[in-house]
């Protein structure tokens, strides 16, 4: 079991012209909300399939009036995740719908209104417990960008959320044949004795004694591959109980048309009628004159009036290119600090720096420690664009806020007490040891197996650890 | 002349893991200017760039976020090469699998030499 | 699934030229440069364009690339029939943080 967690990052305008106009006005104020729809394996399903993996509605956004004027920005979201439950295994591969639907808030009778903006589908593959991946899907004149991940629900782990974790029940290690929980290693992987035979790589269980299949897996033990060859449906194979897929989406899904063209389904494919300015296929030509300024660096553009002919740029001295973008190579003195990356864009020199480092040249370690105070005496250490606090004996926790318990690891060994101590810890240790953790036994004939104590310690005595 | 020689199995099993060399002539992976990375082609995904290597005064790597919990490239500088390691594969990962060098001094992103792919199926 | 749109198909006559765009969003094409690959079949593919319209050696001037905020194209002038091949445009995308293709598109060249 475990969740899919799914971050509306912006929805608003996609790129180029054609913007289109705001779903909002002063006279019909209204709000944006996300459904997202999952579905196990890669299979190219049609929208209104079931949503077998599950399926969630996002809370209400603000609500939002357009500005006279104005184009549409990116349109004020929601608050929070979407998240879906899914209680078997993680497919590992899905396919995932998500709308975005606007809601009304002028004088409707009956209540607010509802109306789907923008569809955007797409297949997927990911392992649960991984880290955030992010996407963006354009439908129409919209642009969405999102993050998403899944993550196992306690006992469960792994990257199908199928191994179970259970605290181990000895301190030191986890029982014949069972190994830490990676990443909660202080629990060890639960026994679970599926079917006998049941395939490792293909199957799972989460009772003992059953086999249940992967996607794409059939049979009793899991080791019969979904044949897709038996399908007759004009678009591919059909529904995952015969190992057929069901009818793909139409030639309009997603809209196809680029730069705001508007899609009509023909019974062969689809057309795009484009705005003015674009043509092609998919409304994706434009045509560049002189007038577009093709020529950087001061270059002089030449011909080229309409978007039928050529321009030519003549460059000024120290640029080539036939938009003159390129300047003689500037970065082989290899400027960009901290593993940066040098562009030469011809007009400029550019350092694309990694995550944590900023500054033309990357030369600035981002200062994390900049109003991040540490509490109780701590320290602010940062490297690596992450802060972390090196805190004061006797605390802990990421700000040092929490008060650390020196004893809690048990760190008196062979049976000897741990007292707290405001400078940390005291061990009193078991007859017959001695040392600060008590770790030295002290040999029959009185000897122990350290130097010399300390003048008026005797073995037995509390010892202090410093 | 810069070449890079791919090698490794054709095939396969899904669950196991994907072991790919790319051995460099005529070039160093230590190289200051160069970037050495791995690119997968599929007829459902077409061109997938899915990891990078580069040195400069010490080792980067990076890789694309939804494979990155499964993915491992490892520069081998005794041996002038590089490795990619892909595991728990599945019949997903079935693609011609490309080794190249991003070497163009001002121009990181531009793959100006390939290896000559290796066509890996996935399948049990 | 690829970022960059690229019409599947383009065509034209020898001599003919022939132009193939590629649209992207501000995170890649908008604030990146913009390389082209030419891929034969059963081949790697070949870089011919690499930072807004610089070619590589041995690449004829015939093909050019332009940009425009969000979009960038291909243009083959006078198409010759070893033009026939499948062509991908690709750039990194900053709010991926990785490099990104396009769908690709197969130039065919019509005798």
């Known amino acids: 079991a475990g969740v899919f967690e799914l971050q509306i990052h912006s929805f608003g305008p996609g790129p180029g012209p054609g913007a289109p106009r705001s779903p909002c006005s002063a006279r019909l104020p209204c709000r944006l909300f996300f459904r997202v729809c999952l579905k196990p394996g890669l299979s190219e399903e049609a929208a209104e399939s079931p949503c077998a993996l599950g399926a969630a509605l996002s809370a209400r956004g603000p609500v939002y009036t357009e500005q006279p004027g104005a184009p549409a920005p990116d349109l004020p979201l929601p608050d929070g995740l979407l998240q879906v439950p899914f209680r078997d295994a993680w497919p590992g591969t899905f396919s995932f719908i998500i709308e975005t639907w606007r809601e009304e808030l002028g004088d409707q009778i009956g209540g607010p209104a509802w109306s789907l903006l923008a569809r955007v589908a797409g297949r997927r593959r990911l392992a649960a417990g991984g880290p955030w991946a992010r996407d963006i899907q354009r439908a129409g004149a919209w642009e969405l960008r999102f993050s998403y991940r899944a993550r196992c629900e306690p006992p469960a782990v792994g990257t199908a959320c199928t191994r179970l974790c259970r605290p181990r029940s000895a301190p030191s290690r986890c029982g014949p044949g069972l190994r830490p929980c990676a990443p909660l290693e202080d629990e060890c992987e639960a026994p679970l004795v599926c079917r006998a035979g049941c395939s490792p790589e293909h199957g799972f269980c989460e009772q003992p004694g059953e086999c249940r299949c992967l996607e794409g897996w059939t049979g009793p033990l899991c080791t019969v591959p979904v044949s897709t060859s038996s399908c007759l449906s004009p678009r591919g194979p059909s529904s995952a109980t015969t190992g057929c897929l069901v009818p793909g989406p139409g030639p309009c899904d997603g809209n196809p048309c680029a730069n705001g063209g508007s899609c009509s389904e023909t019974p062969r494919s689809f057309e795009c009628t484009c705005p003015r300015g674009f043509y092609g296929l998919r409304c994706e030509v434009s045509g560049v004159t002189c007038a577009d300024g093709p020529c950087f660096n001061g270059g002089l553009c030449v011909g080229g009036a309409d978007p039928d002919s050529a321009y030519i740029c003549h460059c000024p001295p120290g640029f080539q290119g036939s938009n003159c973008e390129k300047r003689v190579d500037r970065c082989s003195l290899q400027p960009c600090r901290n593993g940066g990356l040098c562009l030469d864009l011809g007009h400029a020199l550019r350092c694309r720096c990694r995550a944590g480092f900023a500054g033309p040249r990357c030369e600035h370690d981002l200062d994390d420690c900049a109003g991040r105070a540490c509490a109780n005496g701590g320290t602010c250490v940062e490297g690596g664009g992450a802060h972390r606090c090196s805190c004061a004996l006797g605390f802990g926790g990421r700000d040092c806020r929490e008060r650390a318990d020196p004893c809690a690891a048990r760190p008196c060994a062979h049976g000897g007490r741990c007292y707290a101590h405001f400078s940390g810890l005291v061990c009193a240790c078991a007859p017959g040891y001695m040392g600060a953790r008590c770790e030295f036994p002290v040999h029959p004939d009185g000897a122990s197996a350290l130097p010399a104590a300390p003048p008026g310690l005797r073995p037995g005595d509390p010892q202090r650890y410093l | 002349q810069v070449q890079l020689q791919q090698s490794g199995p054709g095939l396969v099993k899904p669950s196991q893991t994907l072991s790919l060399t790319c051995a460099i002539s005529g070039d160093s992976v230590s190289s200051n200017s160069a970037t050495w990375n791995w690119i997968r082609q599929s007829p459902s995904t077409g061109l997938e760039w899915l990891a990078r290597?580069?040195?400069?005064?010490?080792?980067?790597?990076d890789y694309e976020v939804s494979v990155k919990s499964q993915i491992t490239i490892n520069p081998d500088t005794s041996k002038n090469q590089f490795s990619l390691q892909l595991n728990s594969v599945t019949p997903e990962d079935t693609a011609v699998y490309y080794c190249?060098?991003?070497?163009?001094?001002?121009?990181?992103?531009?793959?100006?030499?390939w290896g000559q792919g290796t066509m890996v199926t996935v399948s049990s | 699934q690829s970022v960059l749109t690229q019409p599947p198909s383009a065509s034209g006559t020898p001599g003919q030229g022939v132009t193939i765009s590629c649209s992207g969003s501000s995170s890649n094409i908008g604030s990146n440069p913009v390389n082209w690959y030419q891929q034969l079949p059963g081949t790697a593919p070949k870089l011919l364009i690499y930072s807004n319209n610089q070619r590589p050696s041995g690449v004829p001037d015939r093909f050019s690339d332009s940009k425009s905020g969000t979009s960038a194209s291909l243009a083959i002038s006078g198409l010759q029939s070893e033009d026939e091949a499948d062509y991908y445009c690709?750039?990194?995308?900053?709010?991926?943080?990785?490099?990104?293709f396009g769908t690709g598109t197969k130039v065919t060249v019509l005798t």
């Open positions: 290597t580069y040195y400069r005064s010490k080792w980067y790597n």
């Open positions: 690709s750039a990194w995308d900053d709010w991926l943080n990785g490099y990104v």
């Open positions: 190249a060098r991003g070497g163009i001094v001002g121009a990181p992103d531009a793959f100006d030499i």
